[in-house]
């Protein structure tokens, strides 16, 4: 049976089996094209997420759906009630924190009070003055917290205390791509590493370990991506693994946070990056060891240059690097966080393409995550 | 067996309209973006239009812009394409196609048109 | 617009020659760039993508060469099927447009 599972794919009506290479391959093999069922799915960007966060400590955010303008939300009578459907109106299932935070001389927004109806958020109709002086700071998940900070140097190994949010995404055994952990139940990665492989079966998740191989794996029961983009294919580069049991926390197996919707880096501003990927362009092989290196934005323009991407970056995604070449992401790579640290750590990119690895005027691209917070909102919620 | 077959294609005066469709079969069609090319007798081949796999995204050529609409109806395997106020120069064979983007080195993708009707033939004249 | 400009316009050839078409852009593609063949009144076949990437079920004689703006079909033994037009097709950025073709025909 291990072998007839390994190998082949069971139809039903009438029962016969198919090889287990035709499972997702975008031909109809079985009868009832059962054979193309359990694969990876589009799932498409969807309507904007009336709620968000600001950099600005965290701040809530509503929106008047009949204006298009945002809010901010004002403390007075707050409940946690208001918090959990904030929380699940981005998606999450989890049990969030709230706190009043001083209403700052650089507020740029309304400030209004918030009511609930049919499980969204709303401005209340005969919103006064914000008589708390407060605005809402909410937290959904705790997130972005690690037992180590690294030090701040080239490249060099890492240790899963640092980034207990790492995982390995292997098909059939081997490491394809890295991911990180967003929640318990979903993991972040990049669309391209399901390219080859559609058949959400053959995908597991090894969390909690910085070497490859030497942890369990976690068995997949979703994978979503974005309806692909013919005018622009390296756009998009995001998905979602949905987990078949939720994870559970430890200091080795912890989530990052999403970015902040304004969260807008300058050139030069420090980032983090980690993967199990090949150390040289052409070195053919793996690291068995998760490596660290420090990297800085890059600015778009100089990055779009003639000498470097020719405008293929979009205003979908990053560059990460230093000016001189010699760090990068690489193969292997793609799927894993590109990271920024304030109060929590933040996954601010996913490793997705660049031509070859380390050049000076070709740094890695990244999906810019904040481009895509509104999908992620809109596939957890639909899949709460 | 991976099949696309177009249909709707005829004479037609310039001006007029014409709607042409394409049935696929043997894939799963709602996983791919499709596209129009067309071949105008004795000449190359143009690509008209594309369409992505949930219809989010469609992309014309300048030349048909403001007159050709792009279109498919998943749950029927179908592709469509509206032309409106057709010319002369319309005329062509009209095939559809089905877009591939596989993956390279380190996230890039390549992309390429993998399977093709047999064509329908549109004729504008008066 | 990218412009795709091939050459010969049209070539004879006999069967077991060696024939090589070239395709040069109006810019660089990199290696973003597909190759099609077509046979009167049928369909156009996927020969080659990423410039030197071979579709599969497409035999081995075919390769392609080249990267930047120009680029190179070779057929390394011609066979009695092989006589049609032979296309190239940037797919470095939309609009994906097809060079003019070229017609190879037995001498």
């Known amino acids: 049976k291990v072998i007839l599972d390994k190998y082949y794919f069971l139809c039903g009506q009438p029962l016969h089996f198919i090889p287990r290479k035709q499972l997702c391959d975008g031909e109809l093999d079985c009868p009832l094209g059962e054979d193309e069922e359990h694969c990876v799915k589009s799932f498409p960007e969807g309507p904007a997420v009336a709620v968000r966060l600001s950099k600005d400590r965290s701040t809530l955010q509503v929106l008047d759906s009949a204006t298009g303008n945002w809010f901010s939300a004002c403390f007075d009578n707050f409940t946690e009630a208001l918090a959990e459907t904030a929380c699940r109106q981005m998606g999450y299932s989890s049990k969030p924190t709230f706190r009043a935070v001083e209403i700052g001389p650089d507020q740029d927004l309304d400030v209004v009070e918030i009511t609930e109806n049919s499980q969204e958020l709303r401005m209340r109709n005969s919103s006064g003055p914000c008589l708390s002086g407060s605005l809402v700071s909410l937290h959904c998940l705790a997130c972005g917290k690690s037992l180590k900070t690294p030090r701040v140097v080239g490249v060099e190994e890492a240790s899963v205390d640092s980034w207990p949010w790492q995982v390995s995404i292997q098909y059939d055994k081997q490491h394809v791509c890295g991911g990180s952990i967003l929640d318990p139940h979903w993991v972040l990665t990049a669309a391209h590493c399901f390219r080859k492989h559609t058949d959400v079966f053959n995908w597991k998740v090894r969390a909690g370990s910085d070497k490859l191989g030497s942890f369990p794996s976690l068995a997949v029961a979703k994978i979503i991506i974005i309806e692909f983009n013919p005018m622009y294919p390296k756009d998009n580069d995001i998905a979602l693994m949905k987990l078949q049991f939720p994870l559970t926390f430890s200091g080795t197996v912890r989530p990052i946070c999403l970015p902040f919707f304004d969260e807008e880096l300058t050139p030069a501003t420090p980032l983090w990056i980690i993967g199990w990927g090949f150390t040289k362009q052409n070195g053919g092989k793996m690291s068995d060891i998760l490596l660290q290196a420090s990297v800085q934005v890059i600015d778009s323009t100089r990055c779009n240059a003639d000498d470097a991407y020719q405008g293929e970056v979009t205003e979908k995604m990053m560059c990460a690097g230093i000016p001189e070449g010699g760090v990068d992401t690489c193969q292997g790579d793609s799927g894993g966080p590109l990271m920024y640290q304030s109060d929590q750590w933040h996954v601010v990119g996913i490793v997705s393409w660049g031509y070859g690895c380390g050049g000076p005027s070709t740094p890695g691209v990244y999906t810019k995550v904040s481009a895509y917070l509104n999908w992620i909102y809109n596939v957890w919620k639909a899949e709460l | 067996e991976v099949q696309l077959l177009e249909s709707g294609g005829g004479l037609v005066q310039p001006g007029g309209s014409l709607r042409l469709s394409c049935a696929a079969s043997?894939?799963?069609?709602?996983?791919?973006?499709m596209s129009w090319v067309r071949q105008a007798p004795g000449k190359g081949l143009e690509w008209v239009s594309s369409i992505s796999s949930a219809s989010s995204y469609k992309y014309y050529a300048d030349s048909v812009k403001g007159r050709f609409t792009i279109s498919r109806d998943n749950s029927k395997n179908t592709l469509y394409l509206q032309m409106n106020s057709l010319r002369a120069e319309d005329t062509a064979v009209y095939y559809c196609a089905r877009d591939i983007y596989s993956s390279g080195w380190r996230g890039y993708y390549y992309y390429g048109m993998d399977v093709w009707g047999q064509g329908t033939t549109v004729t504008v004249s008066s | 617009d990218i412009q795709m400009t091939q050459s010969p316009s049209s070539l004879s050839a006999s069967v077991g020659d060696r024939v090589t078409i070239t395709c040069r852009a109006s810019q660089g593609i990199r290696n973003d760039l597909n190759w099609y063949q077509q046979k009167p009144g049928k369909a156009p076949k996927l020969l080659i993508y990423a410039a030197t990437r071979l579709q599969s079920g497409v035999p081995s004689r075919f390769s392609g060469s080249g990267s930047g703006t120009d680029f190179t079909l070779t057929i390394s033994s011609l066979q009695p099927e092989d006589f049609a037009t032979y296309y190239c097709q940037q797919a470095h950025s939309f609009p994906y447009s097809f060079g003019q073709g070229t017609r190879l025909e037995i001498k």
């Open positions: 043997g894939f799963t069609f709602s996983s791919y973006a």
